[in-house]
Interface confidence: low
């Protein structure tokens, strides 16, 4: 039935949106010398570009392919840390080891972490009311097909030995309708990348199971191993005591605080 | 409206300091990196420094490295500029200037500009 | 450093005539597919004042008698009907590379 206006599932846009992604463009742009001649303004015509006055179910990766150019980054690929479940410790990390990469430390990815956005059909409104939700209207909308599209460049870009971050906590530890597991797994090059490692984060402070035996981590080396990437997998048990031995790696204590299961 | 007010200028022996404040108002002064900007009696503009919103990256002109200072008090909506070791070619009238919000190095925005002369 | 060279150092053109100033780069500025170069006007006594960004982009508020043009080391700003108000001196600004760096000026008189 026709509606004066689309009433959708999911939240609707993030208020001051555009001020957000541009404020956080020219942040970003001056923490990181390398990226300070991106100009911004264009970033953001890009970026609204990819979904104002586009049906917001109705939106391809091709739609972010001006902003995908202009936000071109190289990032050094052998430092490149996926998460899944777990973005908080993920960026924790990244922040204390400032040599590796989650995609949100790029600037498409912190442009647009925690955000929601989209438009409606042939009106150049935001729509700051509701937003397509993936599960109950749409996969094709413009969030999902952002991250979709970054996650999936990202990807691509890995090498050697490529990290993940993975939720020991959750009944599907690895699950495959997460981004990394529908999206990233799927892009890594073979020919590029040695190995894929994974990390699994334990919650119970007396969880001293291997969660590496876990039936949806075999999946994972499945699924790994079947692309000829090798596979292996750590318990971190204590994610606190983990990142306390990142910022102090010459604690005696650290010595053993990453337990290794390796598979290959 | 924008207002940028340089003040602190004035007559300095060489090798002596001066500290110049650039007042801000009309802006949300933290969302702006800030710059200052000199000229010369008679000549063109010379870009001297740069700092970010959260004062987290600083950029110097080679020539003033290790004697000027850029700072600012997000607080107190305030840019800064201390001078040591005044050398008679730091004579000019110094501009603080508002970076462009969407792109690094240009300016939108110029204070009046404060004159400082370096004589014996 | 890049080395902005402005010419003319002075100009002079009658009311309602063309004034062209060109800016010359020791290198490229451009970068991402956009020209970091911008033009400022400069009144005795006053702050410069921004009137073309990134090449072409007419800041708001400046008339559209001025105009920008160019790519890579080439640059030129145009005022298509030379007025009284736009007696100055003209300045051209790269922000491709640190340090940011002006060109000498080129200053329009009527004449």
């Known amino acids: 039935v026709p509606r004066w206006r689309q009433q959708w599932s999911g939240p609707g846009t993030t208020k001051r949106f555009p001020e957000t992604v541009l404020a956080r463009c020219v942040k970003y742009t001056e923490i990181h010398p390398e990226m300070r001649h991106v100009d911004c303004q264009s970033v953001w015509d890009a970026f609204k570009g990819a979904f104002i006055s586009k049906h917001p179910c109705n939106i391809t990766e091709e739609d972010y392919q001006p902003l995908m150019k202009l936000g071109t980054q190289t990032v050094p690929c052998n430092k490149i840390l996926l998460w899944s479940r777990i973005k908080d410790l993920a960026h924790q990390f990244t922040q204390v080891q400032r040599d590796m990469f989650t995609l949100e430390d790029t600037l498409l990815g912190y442009l647009a972490d925690d955000l929601t956005w989209c438009g409606e059909f042939n009106t150049s409104k935001i729509n700051y009311q509701s937003c397509p939700d993936w599960r109950k209207d749409c996969s094709n909308n413009p969030v999902s097909v952002f991250w979709k599209t970054v996650s999936r460049r990202f990807a691509e870009a890995a090498c050697d030995v490529v990290h993940v971050m993975l939720n020991g906590s959750r009944s599907k530890i690895f699950d495959k309708n997460s981004t990394f597991g529908s999206v990233e797994v799927h892009n890594l090059q073979p020919e590029k990348v040695q190995t894929l490692e994974a990390w699994v984060i334990h919650g119970g402070r007396e969880d001293s199971r291997d969660l590496c035996q876990d039936p949806t981590i075999k999946e994972l080396e499945s699924i790994i191993s079947k692309r000829n990437i090798q596979f292996s997998c750590k318990n971190i048990y204590r994610p606190d005591k983990f990142l306390q031995c990142v910022k102090n790696p010459e604690d005696s204590s650290c010595t053993s605080e990453i337990h290794h299961h390796h598979h290959h | 409206e924008v207002q940028l007010v340089e003040s602190g200028g004035g007559l300095v022996q060489p090798g002596g300091s001066l500290r110049l404040s650039c007042a801000a108002s009309?802006?949300?002064?933290?969302?702006?990196?800030m710059h200052w900007v000199r000229q010369a009696p008679g000549k063109g503009l010379e870009w001297i420094a740069f700092i970010s919103t959260g004062s987290s990256n600083i950029y110097y002109v080679d020539k003033v490295k290790g004697r000027f200072t850029i700072s600012r008090d997000n607080a107190k909506n305030t840019l800064y500029l201390q001078m040591t070791s005044l050398r008679a070619e730091d004579t000019a009238v110094y501009y603080c200037?508002?970076?462009?919000?969407?792109?690094?190095?240009?300016?939108?925005?110029w204070g009046q500009g404060t004159t400082v002369t370096v004589s014996s | 450093d890049i080395v902005l060279t402005q010419s003319p150092a002075s100009l002079a053109v009658s009311l309602g005539e063309r004034a062209t100033i060109n800016c010359r780069a020791s290198e490229s500025v451009d970068n991402y597919g956009i020209s970091f170069m911008h033009w400022y006007q400069q009144k005795p006594g006053q702050p410069p004042k921004l009137l073309i960004y990134r090449a072409s982009n007419l800041e708001s508020g400046v008339p559209a008698r001025f105009s920008g043009s160019g790519s890579r080391t080439d640059f030129t700003l145009t005022i298509s009907s030379l007025q009284a108000e736009d007696v100055a001196v003209y300045y051209c600004?790269?922000?491709?590379?640190?340090?940011?760096?002006f060109g000498g000026g080129t200053k329009v008189e009527i004449k």
């Open positions: 009309g802006f949300t002064f933290s969302d702006y990196g």
């Open positions: 200037a508002r970076n462009y919000v969407s792109s690094y190095g240009y300016f939108d925005y």
């Open positions: 600004q790269q922000t491709n590379k640190d340090p940011l760096t």
